[in-house]
């Protein structure tokens, strides 16, 4: 969490941003909130990016003002206009790309004063893993697949029964570059699995951590998966 204040005491307002991650090929949100004003026409929101000459986005007098917008962001940005009055200056970014990563500044002017806060925005790819029993294998084998990751993640297997066990010797992980030549498909195979046990395939990079669980019994197979972003730090 980054909390920024205006420069001159009495005329400063609090602006809060949250470091976040964008999944390339999706829309992303850069979070920013501020002390609200009672008049929308008195609020100015400017988003800037370090190293970029033009503005990322500007909203003033109740509407978008994009004449100074940098070409890199043309047609891609929006604020939530109906939520500005309650102090939401968050930015929506269409079709996030790797090049969108960097340091952004959310700069606010209201009738109460000015304030700004920086935000670290990471970009990469992350997806939910799916764990299945590999019936083609000669022994009981599990196959964990996740379609898109970047940067290259680590893959670790764990088991409920053998807690703390190191499965690196009985697993094999491969990374296959996807057609757009950025993201990669992750495939990890775990050999010699035992029945009546729950296995977890954990995929992690510096942006996200995802886990796929599978419980194999004589009568059924149960699966579940979840994903969490790692760098949601507020400023």
């Amino acid at each position: 969490l980054i909390i920024g204040f205006g420069i001159s005491g009495r005329h400063s307002i609090t602006v809060t941003t949250v470091a976040s991650a964008g999944n390339i090929g999706e829309d992303g949100i850069l979070s920013c909130t501020f002390e609200p004003d009672i008049k929308l026409s008195d609020i100015v929101i400017q988003w800037l990016k370090e190293g970029v000459l033009g503005l990322v986005h500007e909203f003033k007098e109740g509407k978008d003002e994009l004449s100074e917008q940098d070409e890199m962001f043309r047609g891609r940005t929006a604020v939530f206009a109906d939520q500005v009055i309650v102090g939401n200056a968050s930015l929506r970014l269409k079709n996030v790309q790797l090049t969108d990563a960097g340091t952004y500044k959310c700069y606010i002017i209201t009738s109460k004063g000015k304030g700004n806060a920086n935000l670290e925005y990471k970009t990469g790819a992350f997806s939910m893993p799916e764990v299945n029993v590999d019936y083609n294998a000669s022994s009981e084998t599990l196959r964990c697949e996740a379609p898109r990751w970047f940067p290259q993640p680590t893959v670790v297997w764990a088991s409920q029964v053998d807690q703390g066990a190191n499965f690196s010797e009985v697993s094999n992980t491969s990374f296959e570059l996807n057609s757009e030549n950025v993201t990669m498909k992750v495939v990890s195979v775990l050999y010699n699995v035992t029945i009546n046990n729950t296995y977890s395939c954990m995929i992690e990079n510096d942006i996200a951590k995802a886990t796929g669980d599978i419980k194999v019994t004589e009568s059924e197979i149960k699966r579940r998966s979840h994903l969490q972003l790692l760098n949601s730090k507020a400023s």
């Epitope: 999944n23 390339i24 090929g25 999706e26 829309d27 986005h57 509407k63 978008d64 994009l66 043309r74 047609g75 891609r76 940005t77 929006a78 604020v79 206009a81 109906d82 929506r92 269409k94 079709n95 790819a125 997806s127 379609p147 898109r148 996807n178 057609s179 757009e180």
Partner: antibody
Framework: EVQLVESGGGLIQPGGSLRLSCAAS????????MNWVRQAPGKGLEWVSV???????DCADSVKGRFTISRDNSKNTLYLQMNSLRAEDTAVYYC??????????WGQGTTVTVSS | EIVLTQSPGTLSLSPGERATLSCRAS???????LAWYQQKPGQAPRLLIY???SRATGIPDRFSGSGSGTDFTLTISRLEPEDFAVYYC??????????FGQGTKLEIK
């Protein structure tokens, strides 16, 4: 040259299925938001479905549960699987690339007629 | 659900005249996500304006877009014979993800 070419349209009975294809050249499908948009005879444009660069998909309520958008990255091709077709699905179907600057590349369209 | 309402439904003008087409949204739309398209009979739509006011590649400068919030305008400063067509506005980002207006037919008077 940046181009989209649709195929797969035709005459189909109500309740039937059809798969439309859209072959892309000059750009990579999986780096863009790719859409299907349709136009019923004498009517306006109606958005049908999108597949994001990430592979996630979304579609209009009118086709939810019946139509599925997909892509084959190795063939650089977009698809629309249409099941449980109805008379009101009769239209020209366009595939369109939504680049950063709006739907800037369109195919020529393929006609789907649902009739008994 | 965002509804885009275009007016007039039909606009009858002569070559050389100025055309003003309106697109009104039922709730606020980001300027970045508002586009205009031209469609001629038997052809696919063609992108004219994106980001409410930026001309797409190859579009003549007689076409201009303006507006913000809920009111957007497409202006053709001096009509050429090839400009007579149907024009659609379109938004991105709300539910449904993409919405088109019903269209304005620009016909020769």
């Amino acid at each position: 040259e940046v181009q989209l070419v649709e195929s797969g349209g035709g005459l189909i009975q109500p309740g039937g299925s059809l798969r439309l294809s859209c072959a892309a050249s000059g750009f990579i499908v999986s780096r863009n938001y790719m859409n299907w948009v349709r136009q019923a005879p004498g009517k306006g444009l109606e958005w049908v479905s999108v597949i994001y660069g990430s592979g996630r998909t979304d579609c209009a309520d009118s086709v939810k549960g019946r139509f599925t958008i997909s892509r084959d990255n190795s063939k650089n091709t977009l698809y629309l699987q249409m099941n449980s077709l109805r008379a009101e699905d009769t239209a020209v179907y366009y595939c369109a690339r939504d680049g950063d600057y709006g739907m800037d590349v369109w195919g020529q369209g393929t006609t789907v007629t649902v009739s008994s | 659900e965002i509804v885009l309402t275009q007016s007039p439904g039909t606009l009858s003008l002569s070559p050389g005249e100025r055309a003003t087409l309106s697109c009104r949204a039922s709730q606020s739309v980001s300027s970045s996500y508002l586009a205009w398209y031209q469609q001629k009979p038997g052809q696919a739509p063609r992108l004219l304006i994106y980001g409410a006011s930026s001309r797409a590649t190859g579009i003549p400068d007689r076409f201009s877009g303006s507006g913000s919030g809920t009111d957007f305008t497409l202006t053709i400063s001096r009509l050429e014979p090839e400009d007579f067509a149907v024009y659609y506005c379109q938004q991105y980002g709300s539910s449904p993800l993409y919405t088109f207006g019903q269209g304005t037919k620009l016909e020769i008077k």
